[in-house]
């Protein structure tokens, strides 16, 4: 607790004091009072700096002193030997000594009393702005006429802050203008004006005459304006040296003049008007503005359209123009908002063709699409060129907006078939001469791939087994192999409706319409070892001709064994029906005048035993186009026989694509159409 | 008809190599694919290899790489299987099996030919 | 290499009973698998090929199903002669591999 006044003994004071002896005093008086501290015997053993014993008066951290040795007053009628006068409320006493001493001290006894101090005078800060009253115990500031005391006791100003201006014209000026302005004071004035509208403020430099800055060029007292999140200012000086008109942007302006304790001058005197809020002509890149005026203000609107083959993106929706609005913030609404190129996006892919990775994807881009050559071609045409559209379509020039179709090129085969030595009397074969092979393994047979969903095979290869299981793009029929290939599964057959199913067909003599489709489950990917024979064309120039050769490929029975397991290809010449019919049938079901010859049959081979035979049925009798050399075309079908080794009958293929045509028309996928 | 007669039994010693051989009749050896399938004594089937004629190469199993070899003589239409570094383990009937089409895996078997390994 | 499970190892049964043994393969084998019977000091015997189609001369008391890794050999009626050792073959890569072989033997 403060007190008034006390005293300090040094330890067994007056008795000697004890060696290594270290004890302190706090004094605290009232706050607002001093402290006279005062010793009245002081006998501590003598050293250098008092190093030995001594008695430390410290106040905060400043030591105030250090006593030993002995003394004695100077006056006769004053006890005190020694004292100290310290301006503040509390301070420490710290007596000390060491392991010995060479006589016997009695230490010292010391009073303090608290002494009032003198707050106006006494301290190097001044702590009023105007008149400073001292009392005992404490003080307090005062105010000349006209000024009141701050709410921290200690500064006086003018009471000039609080003013609201709302009025779209108005004058404001600092206190008492033209005469000097009050010294010490922060003024603040507010305008506030309606929103949409900018507090635009004009002043003469002569209205304007504000104490000057410092050396360093900082405004001893100033004139600041403050908009939302912009500044101008502080201005001082004679004259005003910012610009006499000052477009705030804002429809809130404040104020502030704040003043030092000396140099008053004359102070300033200003204008302020409201302006509806200016937004800017904004650059707005690959657009159009409309209605387009000089200047557009508070409530304006435009309607802002894109160029050809720019658009606004907003979220997903892409749109052609939008409206801004000229807010009362001074900006746009929908400012965000661009007129940007199209974007087309990525290209879509398409089935067996491919399309470059783009450079852009933007408006005026040109992609091309291109199909697995050799294997697949363009239908559709159109060169495969698209550019990127305005409208944020892929298109191109012939197709427009649609996609180009890669679909299989025919009749091609990778490697032309060359006879090597005189099916029976053939030559062995590779898939890559009649990629359009395919292998049927019960009954095993064989079939012609004619495009990428379609199988045409012969019927009675199919009558039996509804659901045969084929195989494309392999030489060999060895089991290793054909796990290796690939294996077509059927969603259906059909059967040509001029095709007689029988109960027993081993009894068979008649093999009118012997043709059949398979419609695939899913398409066939072409390559070097799988790509489909053409169909006849219908003009005449697809009339066979008897001498016209064909190929045939398969691998049904040979010479030597039932089966074969590579496949084997003959080139046969087709033949007039009379040389099919002269011929006795090896092993008659029935009398030879009951077997059926029709012109949907044509007869060929009878060249160096060369012939299909058992188990090539369905394959195609290939012939090279009329009129295009490097292509073949299905103009048969195996079909029967009377013997192996002599002419064989084949399916004329030309009297059926009106068939075939119509079956796979009714029978496609939408993606196919 | 296809007919592979194969050499007869034979007793190894441990360390040893054996030649079995296969001769093919009713077929030319060019047309076939051959196989080698052993049997050890009361256990299952193993497949040894083959020699695939499609990309001219003989494919061994991974159990027997390194210790067998299967070659062909076409001249004589005849098939041998080696197997050496043999060990008690290695007593089997060795097989030469045809390859089948059209997903058969097996048409024709050997006799079979029985090796012994023992010290 | 792919590995054939067969199951079960043994089984028995009687003369009329139906059979069914199960090859499960590590992985998709697709329709690549056959079925055979052998019997004591003699060649195994091709009974089924490509899962389920029948190899011409075998009775049809036979037949097989199954697809990708799990596979069924049935016998409906088990016969006298039908006692015998079965083996399950992938042939959809090599290496070709075969099942342990289950043993029908008479209950």
């Known amino acids: 607790e403060p007190t008034m006044y006390g005293e300090i003994l040094s330890p067994n004071y007056p008795q000697a004091y004890p060696s290594e002896v270290e004890k302190s005093w706090d004094i605290e008086v009232p706050e607002g009072y001093g402290i006279h501290l005062y010793f009245t015997h002081l006998d501590i053993e003598l050293s250098e700096n008092c190093a030995y014993d001594s008695v430390q008066i410290i106040s905060g951290d400043t030591e105030e002193g250090r006593l030993c040795g002995q003394r004695s007053s100077n006056n006769p009628h004053s006890p005190i030997v020694e004292e100290f006068q310290v301006p503040y409320n509390k301070l420490q006493v710290i007596f000390k000594s060491d392991f010995s001493n060479e006589e016997r001290f009695t230490g010292f006894a010391a009073y303090y009393v608290a002494t009032d101090i003198n707050e106006c005078t006494d301290f190097v800060d001044v702590p009023c702005s105007h008149f400073c009253n001292n009392f005992i115990g404490g003080y307090f500031c005062s105010c000349p006429p006209e000024y009141f005391l701050h709410d921290d006791m200690k500064n006086c100003g003018v009471n000039c802050s609080g003013d609201v201006f709302t009025a779209l014209i108005g004058e404001i000026a600092s206190p008492n203008y033209p005469k000097p302005y009050p010294e010490n004071s922060r003024c603040e004035y507010q305008i506030r004006l309606e929103k949409g509208f900018q507090v635009v403020v004009t002043l003469r430099r002569e209205d304007f005459d504000v104490e000057a800055a410092d050396s360093a060029g900082n405004c001893l007292d100033s004139l600041v304006f403050v908009a939302g999140d912009r500044q101008f200012g502080p201005y001082c000086g004679h004259g005003f040296p910012g610009p006499l008109n000052i477009e705030t942007k804002s429809n809130a302006l404040d104020i502030i003049f704040q003043t030092d304790l000396t140099g008053q001058k004359k102070g300033w005197k200003l204008r302020y008007h409201g302006d509806p809020m200016p937004c800017p002509k904004e650059d707005t890149p690959n657009s159009v503005w409309e209605p387009a005026k000089a200047k557009y203000v508070f409530r304006d609107v435009v309607q802002i359209t894109c160029l050809d083959g720019f658009e606004v993106v907003e979220g997903r929706v892409g749109a052609t123009s939008f409206y801004s609005t000229c807010q009362s913030n001074g900006k746009w609404s929908n400012s965000k908002l661009k007129c940007q190129p199209v974007d087309c996006g990525i290209p879509e892919s398409i089935e067996n063709g491919k399309v470059e990775d783009p450079e852009s994807t933007l408006f005026g881009s040109v992609i091309r699409y291109t199909c697995e050559e050799p294997y697949y071609y363009m239908e559709n045409g159109g060169g495969g060129e698209y550019h990127c559209a305005g409208n944020g379509s892929w298109v191109n020039e012939v197709l427009g907006p649609e996609l180009p179709k890669c679909v299989p090129v025919c009749g091609v085969p990778r490697e032309p078939f060359e006879e090597k030595q005189r099916i029976i009397g053939g030559s062995d074969a590779d898939i890559k001469n009649f990629p359009w092979q395919v292998f049927f393994d019960n009954p095993w047979a064989g079939g012609a791939l004619i495009n990428e969903y379609w199988v045409l095979t012969a019927a009675h290869v199919v009558e039996g087994n509804r659901e045969p299981t084929m195989y494309v793009g392999s030489t060999s029929v060895q089991t290793s192999r054909l796990a290796k290939s690939k294996m077509l599964t059927p969603e259906h057959v059909f059967i040509h409706p001029g095709w007689k199913l029988l109960e027993v067909p081993e009894g068979r003599t008649n093999f009118d319409n012997d043709i059949a489709l398979v419609r695939l489950k899913d398409p066939v990917k072409m390559g070097p070892t799988v790509s489909p024979i053409c169909l006849p064309g219908t003009s005449s120039d697809y009339n066979l001709m008897d001498g016209d050769l064909g190929l045939i490929s398969g691998w049904g029975r040979t010479e030597k064994r039932d089966r074969a397991v590579r496949l084997k290809a003959a080139r046969l010449p087709v033949a007039p029906l009379r040389k099919c019919k002269e011929v006795k049938v090896e092993k008659p079901t029935a009398d030879a005048e009951a077997y059926v010859f029709t012109p949907n049959m044509i007869c060929a081979g009878g060249e160096k035993g060369m012939d299909s035979c058992k188990g090539d049925s369905g394959g195609a009798f290939a012939v090279q186009d009329p009129n295009d050399k490097t292509k073949f075309y299905a103009a048969g079908l195996v079909s029967w026989g009377p013997q192996c080794g002599t002419y064989g009958l084949y399916t004329r293929v030309k009297n059926y694509v009106d068939w075939i045509m119509k079956t796979m028309q009714e029978n496609s996928t939408p993606r196919e159409d | 008809q296809v007919q592979l007669v194969q050499s007869g039994a034979e007793v190894k010693k441990p360390g040893a190599s054996v030649k079995v051989s296969c001769k093919v009749s009713?077929?030319?050896?060019?047309?076939?694919?051959m196989h080698w399938v052993r049997q050890a004594p009361g256990k299952g089937l193993e497949w040894m290899g083959t020699?695939?004629?499609?990309?001219?190469?003989?494919i061994y199993a991974q159990k027997f790489q390194g210790r067998v070899t299967m070659t062909e003589d076409t001249s004589t239409d005849t098939a041998y299987m080696e197997l050496s570094s043999l060990r008690s383990e290695d007593t089997a009937v060795y097989y030469c099996?045809?390859?089948?089409?059209?997903?058969?895996?097996?048409?024709?078997w050997g006799q079979g030919t029985l090796v012994t390994v023992s010290s | 290499d792919i590995q054939m499970t067969q199951s079960p190892s043994t089984l028995s049964a009687s003369v009329g009973d139906r059979v069914t043994i199960t090859c499960r393969a590590s992985?998709?084998?697709?329709?690549?698998l056959a079925w055979y019977q052998q019997k004591p000091g003699k060649a195994p015997k091709l009974l089924i090929y490509?899962?389920?189609s029948l190899e011409s001369g075998v009775p049809s008391r036979f037949s097989g199903s199954g697809s990708g890794t799990e596979f069924t050999l049935t016998i409906s009626s088990l016969q006298p002669d039908d006692f015998a050792t079965y083996y399950c073959?992938?042939?959809?890569?090599?290496?070709?591999?075969f099942g342990q072989g289950t043993k029908v033997e008479i209950k």
């Open positions: 009713g077929d030319t050896l060019t047309e076939l694919s």
């Open positions: 490509k899962a389920s």
């Open positions: 099996v045809t390859e089948g089409l059209g997903g058969r895996p097996f048409d024709h």
């Open positions: 073959q992938q042939v959809n890569s090599y290496d070709w591999t």
């Open positions: 020699f695939d004629p499609e990309e001219g190469e003989t």
């Open positions: 992985q998709s084998i697709s329709s690549w």
